[in-house]
Amino acid sequence: QSPIFGPQDVSSIEGNSVSITCYYPDTSVNRHTRKYWCRQGANGYCATLISSNGYLSKEYSGRASLINFPENSTFVINIAHLTQEDTGSYKCGLGTTNRGLFFDVSLEVSQVPEFPNDTHVYTKDIGRTVTIECRFKEGNAHSKKSLCKKRGEACEVVIDSTEYVDPSYKDRAILFMKGTSRDIFYVNISHLIPSDAGLYVCQAGEGPSADKNNADLQVLEPEPELLYKDLRSSVTFECDLGREVANDAKYLCRKNKETCDVIINTLGKRDPAFEGRILLTPRDDNGRFSVLITGLRKEDAGHYQCGAHSSGLPQEGWPVQAWQLFVNEESTIPNSRSVVKGVTGGSVAIVCPYNPKESSSLKYWCHWEADENGRCPVLVGTQALVQEGYEGRLALFDQPGSGAYTVILNQLTTQDSGFYWCLTDGDSRWRTTIELQVAEATKKPDLEVTPQNATAVIGETFTISCHYPCKFYSQEKYWCKWSNDGCHILPSHDEGARQSSVSCDQSSQIVSMTLNPVKKEDEGWYWCGVKEGQVYGETTAIYVAVEERTRGSPHINPTDANARAKDAPEEEAMESSVREDENKANLDPRLFADEREIQNAGDQAQENRASGNAGSAGGQSGSSK
């Protein structure tokens, strides 16, 4: 008795697909050993057709796959485009040879069934409408017309021209004639259900002179499309139910014990388990729609069905499309934090993984909104302007080659709480969902900027200081100037942090930025932040207003300002005499109606270097640490 288990008999028809699941005992060896599918020959030899080692025979090329699901202790063999030649005896098994543990499977592929010449075959999907055509001779033009369904030897009337309708076909069957046609009548049966399948006889007239036609109705249950997705990746269910239900409410449901539980519908219903990670998008006016689910979990695996009905709920006799979703736990997508916590006034740095093979792809960050079908408007992207309401407090830092980019949001409010998606224009599987939870702050922020009312005067020297706690002692401190295409790091002159970390003085840890001389274009948002390598940490923002010098206002000598910087031993002075052509992205409104020019983070740092180090403490050249 084999410990491997599977279907002993599999039967299908030509052109179909099969998906054969083989179950194996849950042991570490079994999970990792070779899985195979072979065909038993008359000589007792079992020829491998496909294996988990990557082998694929010529006859299976382009139509078969073998997928291992170690977490379920199963593997699945999918074979498409079946022909009668596929009929035979097979083994699914485990082991380095085809003589290891196995299970015998018999596959039988039949021809599409044929019927006698006078039988018309109608093949329809569940929920659709069939129109049965019934021909008759002129002699029966005024006779009674009817359609009956064969049940054993009897034929039970479904509908007739005297307006009788069988109760189980009520509101579903109509008998009619088209135009001036004198030799055909038609019967429409709508909202087809599986039990409608069978042999029908339509009849015009009575007795031996009656005209009869046979019709075989096949009602097909939806064959689930098999979807194999990695843990933490995303899946899109593309649903095309046809024009006849274009105006009905649409839904996606997941088959469960009792029913099919609606996950989302166009009437605003949404399963809380999918909050923040689902979008329903109408595709066109013909009723096509798609449902995207991100951040796939192990428990998302199962049978899904999309459909349409005015109630937004599954209804027998309405068209459906089906899928079986498998979620593979051996995922290439790294595990990232699903919940990020922040406090009001503070900041968060969110790391977004993307496919490292697609470092040049465009990166985006969007805010998932719960309204009706869910939507995710882009807030920032490598070629998307920062959305209104996020100016000065949101930036995206790409880190080419690292397989991740960072999104920083500061000046947090409780309204920022919610779900956000990281996405790229490349591999659509790499969409990650983050829930941001913003709580009321209970203490002062870690980074504080002085002065808090920052107004600089053109032509003068202006210094802002950023106070940081000792816990950031060893981290790199930076100032950057925020613009619509990121926050460009400003040059830093390392003048402080000379004392040992043991004797760190909490009150005197400062990193300063000096604008010398102030220009009109220096106006804007500036960020003070900390980072370690490519890992960004806390940030704080300040808006620097720039105004003309008014008569009588004191003129500060630049050297005096820098002398003050020199007097503070723990201070890190940053200085910027940034020229307009270096600090502004070249935007041509004709070229970029809704986009912007972009350099990567490395280029930004280079481009925004201050021109020289005039007036820097001790005349040293600056170095970023």
Epitope: V18, I20, L220, E221, T259, P314
Partner: nanobody, 126 residues
């Protein structure tokens, strides 16, 4: 809800045959697989056979103890599943339960099934 009604049980001699039927009614369009389990007095409910389907493709699973003797089939139009039992043995004596599932991860596991019939007694005398 799906209702299941079994019929066809009875008393037979060893070596004889018997055909059980299980008629499903209600929301049958949600079902994905139907099968048979049996329970002998003082024993656990055990898997006998299951048929699952996907469109016009059928998958039949059997317990080792009934392989080659029992055959499961279904009539889609009648929403009925049949169990043809040949070469019956006294060991086959049990109450036979019909079960239906909407989602089936492992057909051998009773908890995977959502709906159950009341059961029909099969007694095989020697």
């Amino acid at each position: 809800q799906v209702q299941l009604v079994e019929s066809g049980g009875g008393l037979v001699q060893a070596g004889d045959s018997l055909r059980l039927s299980c008629a499903a009614s209600g929301r049958t369009f949600t079902t994905y697989g139907m099968g048979w389990f049996r329970q002998a007095p003082g024993k656990e409910r055990e898997f006998v056979t299951t048929i699952t389907w996907s469109g016009s493709t059928n998958y039949k699973y059997y317990a080792d103890s009934v392989k080659g003797r029992f055959t499961i089939s279904r009539d889609n139009a009648k929403n009925t599943v049949y169990l043809q039992m040949n070469s019956l043995k006294p060991d086959d004596t049990a109450v036979y339960y019909c079960a239906a599932s909407t989602v089936l991860r492992d057909p051998r596991v009773p908890t995977e099934y959502d709906y159950w019939g009341q059961g029909t007694q099969v007694t095989v005398s020697s």
